[in-house]
């Protein structure tokens, strides 16, 4: 190989070892029988060399740096050439570096021809291996503007006081043009301006200078977005950190053409604007940092450009002004990420502040709209707390657990509506009475309705899940000792049509000691399946639950247990079951940790089933499943 660099070309070529490899044999640059691992060639030098191996690209890289001085003479503006031509260089991974030094008052603009650039974050790489690393200068300090691949939206980068552009080409890449030109501009009075052009729908992820390290103190950086007028843009911050400011405040400013409030100033922690039509600018402004503990300012954000959806012009009013202790969250439902571009799905407050999730709180009227191609990608979760603090005032008071119609009218599927029901400890208990009798969901008889009620304890230390219940069964009411959460969970869009079947009333009643009491009034010809709470994890220690099972006078009930033994092993105490006839008070007591479970038994009158747990050893829990079936009496035994 021979490399000859013209005098006054201000080009230096450096061949050096690349990333360490586990290759068995080293490779050297050979110059007049001397074996070396680094070769530097300066302007005006001509050097002939060879490599001591067949595949030098596995060992060496080549850097070609051209210094362009715009301080002492005219600047060579226009299209930048690759010099020396790639055909004259050994086939090594190559990095062309252009280091342009200019006065502070001179603006320099890098213009990228098609394909435009796409910024990548730390740890990311470009599919074709071609990367553009761009840095600027503040006095003597180098500032990294970013690393970019091809096929993006970045068309121009403006800087002042100098720019360093490094183009990395893999040894096998045929590219023989730089793909950019340099133009001079008036001073931009900031660190840099990055222009990002969208031709159609798409997204761009961009980062503050020096990311993931800190943005330079008290600097200003601007991104200009060129967006076709018929499309909408939304900004979301993916990652940010704030530094410790001594003077001024870190902020982002939006300049939105046509807005009467330009510039619109936002804190980094605010929800950022969405649903913007046409071009806009975003600027990041740093502050004067605390010298002792500066912290770091950094920002990574995404701009999503897409067609406005039909829904985006429709305003929905969610009136929560008469509600108390309630919050409504609209958020993306969990989905597997696909690799192709997926338009964003945003919910907007007052049509401007758009984000992928939004929480509305009680006490206000909210106006929302959607910027989303497919509203099935979103769902709603609502939480409402009904609490009683004064037992004298609450006793016998009732509340309807009903999803408000305002919420049902939204074009987004309701996922969960949770009521947290709180009572004063040891003073009051709760009773749930459904509009339609409930069925307990079991493997043997699963619910197939569009919604269910999930009933669980709301006491933080207590792990007690009573079960999942849906309309169309035999459970007339559920009484619970203390705080619970009742969650209406929907399973199908048809819930909108079946919403009339929902309806649950909660009343505060005098305190009782049992954890729960289920009142069951079986219908004839249907088998009722019932199971102990906490089915998968076992009834909690020392917990007692009862079922009050009604038997009509012309019927007989068959009580069947689905195991021979309960399987519970007690560490302390005893686990027992009492089956008690309500009319005669006659009762049978079974030791669940010793006895076999009773064979199917027939009951001609209403009866109780009470199950009380011991403190079981781990892994030997108490789980019971039983059924009640009514059949007509053939002989009157009374």
């Amino acid at each position: 190989f021979e490399i000859a660099l013209p005098r006054e070309s201000n080009i230096t070529v450096l061949i050096k070892l690349g990333t360490p490899t586990l290759l068995a044999k080293p490779c050297y640059i050979v110059i007049s029988k001397r074996h070396i691992t680094m070769l530097s060639i300066k302007s005006g030098e001509r050097i002939v060399f060879t490599f001591s191996c067949q595949s030098p690209e596995n060992h060496f890289v080549i850097e070609i740096q051209k210094n362009i001085d715009c301080m002492s003479g005219p600047c060579p503006f226009g299209e930048v050439q690759l010099q020396p031509s790639t055909s004259l260089l050994p086939t090594l991974n190559r990095t062309f570096i252009w280091d342009v030094k200019a006065h502070k008052s001179i603006g320099l603009e890098l213009q990228f021809s098609i394909p435009r650039l796409r910024q990548i974050g730390p740890g990311e790489s470009c599919p074709d291996g071609v990367t553009h690393s761009i840095s600027g200068r503040i006095d003597a300090t180098v500032v990294r503007i970013g690393t970019f691949c091809s096929n993006g939206t970045v068309s121009r980068i403006k800087m002042q006081e100098g720019v360093k552009m490094a183009l990395h080409l893999p040894w096998f890449h045929p590219r023989n043009v730089s793909g950019f030109s340099i133009a001079n501009r008036s001073s931009i009075k900031r660190l840099c301006i990055i222009e990002s052009v969208f031709e159609g729908e798409g997204s761009a992820t961009l980062m503050s200078a020096n990311y993931p390290e800190g943005f330079p103190e008290d600097e200003l950086m601007t991104w200009q977005f060129v967006v076709p007028a018929h499309l909408r843009a939304s900004v979301s911050f993916l990652n940010f950190n704030l530094s410790n400011c001594e003077r001024k405040e870190e902020r982002v400013e939006y300049y939105i053409p046509g807005s009467t409030t330009n510039p619109e100033v936002f804190k980094l922690e605010d929800k950022q604007p969405g649903n913007m039509a046409g071009n806009f600018n975003l600027s990041l402004q740093g502050c004067d940092q605390d010298a002792q503990s500066p912290g770091i300012l950094r920002l990574q954000f995404q701009v999503l450009v897409q067609h406005p959806q039909n829904e985006s012009n429709k305003i929905y009013v969610v009136d929560l002004s008469n509600e108390r202790a309630m919050s409504l969250t609209i958020e993306p439902r969990p989905v597997k990420q696909s690799r192709k571009f997926v338009p964003g799905c945003f919910v907007c407050l007052e049509s401007r502040t758009c984000s992928s999730n939004l929480t509305l709180t009680s006490g206000s009227k909210h106006k929302i709209s959607f910027l989303c191609d497919d509203l099935t990608r979103l769902w709603m979760n609502v939480e409402k707390t009904i609490s009683c603090t004064d037992h004298r005032y609450c006793q016998r008071k009732s509340y309807s657990l009903q999803v408000p119609s305002d919420i049902l009218h939204l074009p987004v599927e309701l996922h969960d509506f949770s009521w947290k029901l709180l009572v004063p400890k040891d003073r009051l208990s709760l009773v749930l009475v459904p509009a339609q009798k409930l069925q307990q969901h079991t493997h043997e008889k699963p619910c197939n309705t569009s919604f269910s009620y999930l009933v669980a304890s709301a006491i933080p230390s207590q792990d007690l899940y009573f079960g999942s219940f849906c309309p169309g069964g035999s459970i007339k009411q559920i009484q619970v000792k203390q705080n619970i959460s009742v969650t209406l969970r929907t399973f199908a869009p048809s819930f909108q049509q079946e919403a009339s079947r929902q309806g649950l009333t909660v009343s505060f009643i005098p305190y009782f000691k049992e954890e729960g009491v289920f009142t069951v009034t079986p219908d004839t010809k249907s088998k009722v399946y019932l199971r102990t709470p906490n089915w998968d994890r076992g009834l909690p220690s020392l917990t007692s639950v009862s079922w009050n099972i009604s038997v009509p006078r012309d019927q007989v009930a068959c009580l069947t247990f689905f195991k021979e033994r309960s399987g519970v092993v007690c560490q302390t105490g005893r686990a027992f079951m009492i089956i008690q006839e309500q009319r005669t008070r006659a009762e049978e007591i079974f030791s669940l940790d010793e006895d076999v479970l009773p064979k199917p038994s027939f009951h001609h009158h209403s009866f109780w089933v009470n199950i009380s747990n011991c403190s079981p050893t781990s892994g030997k829990q108490l789980d019971l499943l039983f059924s009640v079936t009514l059949t007509p009496r053939t002989v009157d035994l009374t």
């Epitope: 450096l14 070892l17 360490p20 029988k33 001397r34 074996h35 070396i36 691992t37 680094m38 530097s40």
Partner: antibody, heavy 116, light 108 residues
Framework: EVQLVESGGGLVQPGGSLRLSCAAS????????IHWVRQAPGKGLEWVAS????????SYADSVKGRFTISADTSKNTAYLQMNSLRAEDTAVYYC?????????WGQGTLVTVSS | DIQMTQSPSSLSASVGDRVTITCRAS??????VAWYQQKPGKAPKLLIY???SLYSGVPSRFSGSRSGTDFTLTISSLQPEDFATYYC??????????FGQGTKVEIK
């Protein structure tokens, strides 16, 4: 696994001689530059000599030129440093190092003490 | 011979600090500079080669840079295991190899 093990250090009188060995394993010594670097007690690092046995290339620091000789036996995958006319200022821990990405592998060192 | 003037000769720092050590070459050595870490009683370990290339297995908090004949080793966030002595070294072409005098990084 690449390893370098020095041996041959010890106490020697001024004017005396000593031969240090550097046994290499895990790589072929003839493909690489081997260097000797020394460190006097409490002082910094000082390069002494180097050899690239494939082309019989050797090089020495001015302070040892004419007194020290670097060599290698590729069949034994071992490099040597023959030290003659030793002086008190040659007292140091002597390291051998393999060079490619800089001095990427070093031996544990052997102590040479020149004293009467 | 090419002199490598290393500064400071010692410094005190705390865990988490950003530490910078510089070496100035008495004449151009291109990028033929390496940085080493040495702990008492142990052989030196290679950190950086070719002025700015991180050697394999070395934590990414270590970085090297070059500006003309000035070379810098930076530890972005000092860890307890980083307290040691650091040396720069030039190995430019036909010149004898030379080391800097060393910088001892101590706990503040």
């Amino acid at each position: 696994e690449v390893q370098l093990v020095e041996s041959g250090g010890g106490l020697v009188q001024p004017g005396g001689s000593l031969r240090l060995s550097c046994a290499a394993s895990g790589f072929n010594l003839s493909y690489y530059y081997i260097h000797w670097v020394r460190q006097a007690p409490g002082k910094g690092l000082e390069w002494v000599a180097s050899i690239y046995s494939s082309s019989s290339y050797t090089s020495y620091a001015d302070s040892v030129k004419g007194r020290f000789t670097i060599s290698a036996d590729t069949s034994k995958n071992t490099a040597y440093l023959q030290m003659n006319s030793l002086r008190a200022e040659d007292t140091a821990v002597y390291y051998c190092a393999r060079a490619y990405y800089g001095f990427d592998y070093w031996g544990q060192g052997t102590l040479v003490t020149v004293s009467s | 011979d090419i002199q490598m003037t290393q500064s400071p000769s010692s410094l005190s720092a705390s865990v988490g600090d950003r530490v910078t050590i510089t070496c100035r070459a008495s004449q151009s050595v291109s990028s033929a500079v390496a940085w080493y870490q040495q702990k008492p009683g142990k052989a030196p370990k290679l950190l950086i080669y070719s002025a700015s290339s991180l050697y394999s297995g070395v934590p990414s908090r270590f970085s090297g840079s070059r500006s003309g004949t000035d070379f810098t080793l930076t530890i972005s966030s000092l860890q307890p295991e980083d307290f040691a002595t650091y040396y720069c070294q030039q190995s430019y072409y036909y010149y004898p190899i030379t080391f800097g005098q060393g910088t001892k990084v101590e706990i503040k």
